[in-house]
């Protein structure tokens, strides 16, 4: 007997669709081999109609597809616009039609019930709302209005204008009679169930003068929308459930192996821990629609997702839903990068953020994911230079290295900086990525004074000590502003071989401001980099005073070598909807820092890479 299994008989009516699910043992070979749906002819041959390799016969063009679900060991054949000619004997199978593993399926397409003349057909998804329109003549305006459901030869009263409601429709049906002059009444049925399917009869009045109108109500289960996204990318589920449930709690859930639906996120504050740091539920619009964004897609995120509305914030039969089948493509265009970046208290991190390289002109952003309620991600910095006030002097977004990657540097780290951050642009939303910053034990590698007070008109030297492991790196000083960090001109005074050998006396790069002006006040960063790839940074604030005061307080660089090597990079991920950037509900507007003034003039500022002995300090 064949290990392939499916429905033995499928019956439907003309014009409808069928979705035939075939099961196979999910061995490695079976998962990747050809899947097919073929029709058995009189000769015994089975002619392929659709296959997993993309073939679709002319008879099925535009109305059928075959989708493989290798992780479940199933494939599904969808056939729409059925006609009676589709009735026949078929096989779903693996491999070659003539000698593969297969299962016989009988498909019967009938004409469907003969509908009375003038019948209006209503086709609605489960859980949604239907409004049945019932016209009547003037003489029946004052008379009883009613809706019946035809079951076999009998008619069962569903609702009437005398306040009767059939118990099967309790709390989800209403009959509306308009004001004078409008010769039509309507029956609205909410939260449709499959059992509501059938033929209905509107009636106004009684006896031979009564008005009647037939309505055929077809209630269907929603077909899942197929969604293909890249590994490390992101997906947005847009959920529009209708005004009827605008004020009801919303949810997104994932169907599990037991075919129940586990809540991923809902508007009541529930969130699956597997999605921590990489999910947002965008607050709903007035029409009740909302969207859920998941970044950092993993292979295990694949599956069937349902969004819906119910006061409990979870799936309940008879309430509206929308369905998606998510596939995660492992051959991703989004570059692989660490999902966690580690830094030490007082130290720094440099995060590499990927973006679509075709969109180099797009605006770049970095936001902090906050898990409260439905999640939000207020912007911290953007490429146009706006920085949130509390990040002044310690956060910068750099366009380097370019060609599909930008860099975000955050220094003066504290334990409060631990958390999840998202890289995003106003371009291709599929390139949104997420990274977790973790604060670990250790000392910063770069040592600078805690604060510096400079005297107007005098010369200022600021030392920055670095460990031997950075000897081959390029060192720099830059002046921070909310539009970036402007590198200051470098003056290498020490012999280059001193750095190569990493002499005890050569592990220092100093900044000289000569003479100090008012414009020199502000934040300065000492940093290391390799080409366009940034490493650690250390920040120092320079205050400028009129009268002569003691210069700088020097921080001993003891244990400078002890801090661990810092991982640079972030996790690649993917989308939120385009409008998210402009959407103040997703990215709450925050106060931004004003520009900190002119950059330090190049002629007055210099970076000196020289012996630490000359600075009056030593590093062990």
């Amino acid at each position: 007997k064949s290990p392939v299994f499916g429905p033995q008989e499928v019956s439907s009516v003309e014009g409808n669709s069928v979705s035939i699910k075939c099961y196979y043992p999910p061995t490695s070979v079976n998962r990747h081999t050809r899947k097919y749906w073929c029709r058995k002819g009189a000769s015994g041959r089975c002619i392929t109609l659709v296959s997993s390799e993309g073939y679709v016969s002319s008879n099925y063009a535009g109305r059928a597809n075959l989708t493989n679900f290798p992780e479940n060991g199933t494939f599904v054949v969808n056939i729409a616009q059925l006609s009676r000619d589709d009735s026949g004997h078929y096989k779903c199978g693996l491999g070659i039609n003539s000698r593969g593993l297969s299962f016989d399926v009988s498909l019967e397409v009938s004409q469907g019930p003969e509908l009375p003349n003038g019948t209006e057909v209503y086709t609605v998804d489960v859980g949604r709302t239907v409004t049945i329109k019932c016209p009547f003549k003037t003489e029946n305006a004052p008379k009883t209005k009613a809706l019946y459901k035809k079951i076999g030869q009998t008619s069962v009263l569903v609702i009437d204008s005398r306040n009767y409601v059939n118990p099967n429709y309790k709390d989800r049906i209403r009959l509306r009679i308009p004001g004078t002059g409008q010769l039509i009444f309507t029956v609205v049925i909410d939260r449709l169930r499959l059992s509501d399917h059938g033929l209905y009869l509107c009636q106004a009045g009684d006896g031979s003068n009564r008005d009647e109108k037939n309505a055929d109500l077809q209630v269907l289960e929603p077909e899942p929308e197929l969604v293909y996204e890249d590994l490390r990318g992101s997906v947005t589920f847009h959920c529009a459930l209708g005004l009827e449930v605008a004020n009801v709690a919303k949810f997104l859930c994932r169907v599990n192996s037991r075919e129940t639906c586990d809540v991923v996120i809902n508007t009541l504050g529930k969130r699956d821990s597997a999605f921590e740091g990489r999910i947002l539920l965008n607050p709903q619009d007035k029409d009740g629609s909302f969207s859920v964004v998941i970044t950092g897609l993993r292979k295990e995120d694949e599956g069937r997702y349902l969004c819906g509305a119910h006061s409990d914030g979870q799936l309940q039969e008879g309430w509206p839903i929308q369905a998606w089948q998510l596939f995660v493509n492992e051959e991703s265009t989004i570059p692989r990068s660490p999902t966690v970046v580690k830094g030490v208290a007082g130290g720094s991190v440099a995060v590499l953020c990927p973006y679509n390289p075709k969109e180099s002109q797009s605006l770049k952003y970095w936001c902090l994911w906050e898990g409260a309620q439905n999640g939000r991600c207020p912007l911290l910095v953007e490429s146009q230079g706006l920085v949130q006030e509390q990040y002044e002097g310690r956060l910068s977004l750099l366009q380097e290295p370019g060609n599909g990657t930008f860099t975000v540097i955050l220094n003066q780290l504290t334990t409060q900086d631990a958390g999840f951050y998202w890289c995003l642009t106003n371009g291709d939303t599929r390139w949104r990525t997420t990274v977790e910053i973790k604060i670990i034990e250790g000392e910063p590698n770069l040592k600078v004074p805690g604060n510096v007070t400079a005297v107007l008109g005098e010369t200022l030297n600021i030392p920055c000590h670095f460990p031997c492991k950075f000897s081959s790196y390029e060192k720099y000083w830059c002046k921070w502003s909310n539009t970036g960090c402007q590198t200051l001109p470098s003056q290498d005074e020490g012999p280059s071989e001193a750095f190569v050998n990493c002499d005890e006396n050569s592990r220092l790069v100093s900044l000289t401001l000569n003479p100090v002006t008012r414009a020199d006040e502000g934040w300065y960063w000492c940093g290391v980099k390799q080409g366009h790839f940034y490493g650690e940074t250390a920040a120092v604030y320079v205050a400028v005073e009129e009268k002569k005061v003691a210069g700088s307080r020097y921080v001993s660089p003891a244990k400078a070598d002890a801090a661990p090597d810092e991982k640079v990079l972030d996790s690649g991920v993917r989308e939120i909807e385009n409008k998210a950037i402009q959407d103040p509900r997703l990215f709450a507007e925050e106060k931004v820092v004003a520009d900190t003034g002119d950059q330090a003039g190049g002629s007055r500022a210099s970076v000196d890479s020289s012996s630490s002995e000359e600075q009056g300090g030593s590093s062990k």
């Epitope: 429905p7 099961y23 169930r193 499959l194 929603p222 075919e259 129940t260």
Partner: nanobody, 128 residues
Framework: QVQLVESGGGLVQAGGSLRLSCAAS????????MGWFRQAPGKEREFVAA??????????YSADSVKGRFTISRDNAKNTVYLQMNSLKPEDTAAYYC???????????????????WGQGTLVTVSS
């Protein structure tokens, strides 16, 4: 969940027929996938047949061992699912259970774990 009550079991000779019924309480019966399973003494519960209606089409499934002999059907108006058993064999002797799988999703109909409501069972004995 729906409540399920089976009936129609009994003693029958090999080659004979029986019709099992499963009456469901609950207004949402039509949206459930319904299945029949059986369990012979000392054996595991095994899938017999299932039926699923999605509002537009009906899907019938059956185990290889009963193919061509047993037919599953349902009457949504009566909240009932039936199992017509023809050409019965002694190896069909077992307790037969009706089960319901909740909407809106239907998994592998052969897997008992995908059903959340079960009846008490009705005994079918086929003598040779």
């Amino acid at each position: 969940q729906v409540q399920l009550v089976e009936s129609g079991g009994g003693l029958v000779q090999a080659g004979g027929s029986l019709r099992l019924s499963c009456a469901a309480s609950g207004r949402t019966f039509s949206s459930y996938a319904m299945g029949w399973f059986r369990q012979a003494p000392g054996k595991e519960r095994e899938f017999v047949a299932a039926i699923h209606w999605n509002g537009a089409s009906t899907y019938r499934y059956s185990a290889d061992s009963v193919k061509g002999r047993f037919t599953i059907s349902r009457d949504n108006a009566k909240n009932t699912v039936y199992l017509q058993m023809n050409s019965l064999k002694p190896e069909d002797t077992a307790a037969y259970y009706c089960a319901a799988s909740p909407p809106p999703t239907v998994g592998d109909v052969r897997d008992p774990a995908n059903y959340d409501s079960w009846g008490q069972g009705t005994l079918v004995t086929v003598s040779s």
